[in-house]
């Protein structure tokens, strides 16, 4: 078997449908081909549940898995679906193998598929197979979001990576939420991060010739405190008939902890400002974000006293905002009549 | 306009302290990493030090450790680089720099400002 | 003495391709990308080549950069007057101490 030697099933034929689960050891750098069904039919293939590409290194085209030269990061479980359903035409594992560099020409071609046969091979320090995936070295991401950190290797042996965090070996278990190694994958995955994931994480590839290392600068913003955000244009502006159900949306964001208030603006001895130049106002509806249904508030069978101007009012440790909207409420016998109703404002 | 101005240099005795600040604007300045980088008199390039946005890592070259300490006010947009026990091989001008986000190199410098240690 | 290498000094005549080479080691270049400044006389450091070969708004085109295995290269052609200053390749180190930044000893060009 040749190191150019393509690793390669039967030919591109109608498939049996009674495909066993078949393993292949694959040498680095080697090129595969692997065929499943007719090649105008061919059947759609899949790498751990994701649908390859029709182009790139590694792709799914009229039936055929193609991978130009055979890297660690492309082991794993390989699928091949027949088109339009879920039958499984091609169900294999592909395995990293030793390079190879000689055999006899009458060796046994499928030979390689047997993770015994060992051959002479050439040892390898560790080197990047995607450096290029590496370049972003500083990292800063807001706290709470997702970090993965790759560093694909090879070598021979097949190196091992370990992880490290300010230089002290990295495990995760003093970290909540722990983290996630996918060895297969060369990567680390951290979630919900916090400010004190932050520091240097250095990958470090070895094998018995050699090691190599690289390092990778996390950075966790914390975010800025601010005052309840309200989405612009809510509550909006509605016109209902009289007898008929309401709802008025407001859509709060907030870090901290937000408070939101309904009111209804109401009119006192004529007027509809206090001797402080506030409002009247009446609470229809109180409660955290987290209560049920907060952001809505219904109004059931209104009639012409509903109508008038309405307030969301979300508050939080750091500040107030509002905004409101008018409800016009239109007698029964004439619901083409419109009102012109004043602008949702939203006020510092 | 997006700027860096470092002020603060000048002369001091060896074993002497000074702070040097580095200004900036124009830019998100607290999500940025920054750096200082010297040089010396008709010498080349040498980085000193770097800081992440939040402030909540730092890195230093060996000749410095431990007698440098590099900090920011992200309120105040500046970077500062208190500089201990120093050294006449110290003297530089002392360049603060931002370093882009993700890879790293410096798209920005100030213009300059000048240490000199000596007796 | 600088961690990365290079030729202290290069000259060439107007309208000359001159090119400055960077070498390093595995733990630099090799598994780092390498940026480029120029320093014009009595001024700060200017970014000229980033991310090994990608030039920022403004740098002329007869700037390119290249990278392979642990050396890097800067090449000027068509050279002009303007272009005498000092040049110096930067990358990061991802050395036994942690993360550092280390630049080459500088290269100055002359235009005969």
């Known amino acids: 078997l040749e190191a150019s030697e393509e690793v390669e099933l039967e030919p591109c034929l109608a498939p049996s449908l009674e495909q066993q689960e078949q393993e292949l050891t694959v040498a680095l750098g080697q090129p595969v081909r692997l065929c499943c069904g007719r090649a105008e039919r061919g059947g759609h293939w899949y790498k751990e549940g994701s649908r390859l590409a029709p182009a790139g290194r590694v792709r799914g085209w009229r039936g055929r898995l193609e991978i130009a030269s055979f890297l660690p990061e492309d082991a794993g479980r390989y699928l091949c679906l027949a088109r339009g359903s879920m039958i499984v035409l091609q169900n294999l594992t592909l395995i990293t193998g030793d390079s190879l560099t000689s055999s006899n020409d009458d060796e046994d071609p499928k030979s390689h598929r047997d993770p015994s046969n060992r051959h002479s091979y050439p040892q390898q320090a560790p080197y990047w197979t995607h450096p290029q995936r590496m370049e972003k070295k500083l990292h800063a991401v807001p706290a709470g979001n997702t970090v993965k950190f790759r560093c694909p290797a090879a070598g021979n042996p097949t190196p091992t990576i370990r992880w490290l965090k300010d230089g002290q070996a990295f495990h995760g278990e003093n970290r909540i939420g722990g983290i996630r190694l996918r060895h297969q994958h060369w990567s680390l995955v951290m979630e919900s991060v916090v400010p004190s994931d932050r520091g240097t994480y250095t990958c470090l590839v070895e094998n018995a010739v050699g090691s190599i290392r690289y390092n990778y600068l996390l950075d966790v913003l914390e975010r800025s405190p601010h005052r309840p955000i309200l989405q612009a244009g809510l509550p909006a502006n509605t016109t209902a008939v009289v007898g008929s159900d309401v709802e008025l949306l407001c859509k709060v964001y907030s870090d901290a902890q937000p408070h939101i208030q309904w009111l209804k603006h109401i009119v006192i001895n004529g007027s509809s400002f206090g001797a402080d130049g506030f409002p009247y106002v009446q609470v229809l509806k109180t409660a955290d974000i987290n209560s049920s249904e907060v952001e809505v508030l219904y109004l059931r069978n209104v009639s012409a006293e509903d109508a008038g101007e309405y307030t969301c009012l979300a508050g939080n440790s750091i500040g107030l905002s509002y905004q409101s909207a008018w409800l016009t409420v239109l007698p029964e016998e004439d619901p083409t009549w419109t009102a012109a109703a004043p602008e949702a404002r939203y006020t510092d | 306009e997006v700027q860096l101005l470092e002020s603060g240099g000048g002369l001091v005795q060896p074993g002497g302290s000074l702070r040097l600040s580095c200004a900036a604007s124009?830019?998100?300045?607290?999500?940025?990493?920054m750096s200082w980088v010297r040089q010396a008199p008709g010498k080349g390039l040498e980085w000193v030090s770097l800081?992440?946005?939040?402030?909540?890592?730092?890195y230093y070259a060996d000749s410095v450790q431990g007698r440098f300490t590099i900090s920011r006010d992200n309120s105040k947009n500046t970077l500062y680089l208190q500089m201990n026990s120093l050294r006449a091989e110290d003297t530089a001008v002392y360049y603060c720099?931002?370093?882009?986000?993700?890879?790293?190199?410096?798209?920005?410098w100030g213009q300059g400002t000048l240490v000199t240690v000596s007796s | 003495q600088s961690v990365l290498t290079q030729p202290p000094s290069a000259s060439g005549t107007p309208g000359q391709r001159v090119t400055i080479s960077c070498s390093g080691s595995s733990s630099n270049i090799g598994s780092n990308t390498v940026n480029w400044y120029q320093q014009l006389p009595g001024t700060a450091p200017k970014l000229l080549i980033y991310r090994n070969n990608q030039r920022p708004s403004g740098v002329p085109d007869r700037f390119s950069g290249s990278k392979s295995g642990t050396s890097a290269s800067l090449a000027i052609s068509g050279l002009r007057s303007e272009d005498e200053a000092d040049y110096y390749c930067?990358?990061?180190?991802?050395?036994?101490?942690?993360?550092?930044?280390?630049f080459g000893g500088g290269t100055k060009l002359t235009v005969l």
């Open positions: 124009g830019f998100t300045f607290s999500s940025n990493y």
């Open positions: 800081i992440s946005g939040s402030g909540g890592s730092t």
């Open positions: 930067a990358a990061w180190d991802d050395s036994l101490n942690g993360p550092l930044v280390v």
């Open positions: 720099a931002r370093n882009t986000a993700g890879f790293g190199y410096f798209d920005l």
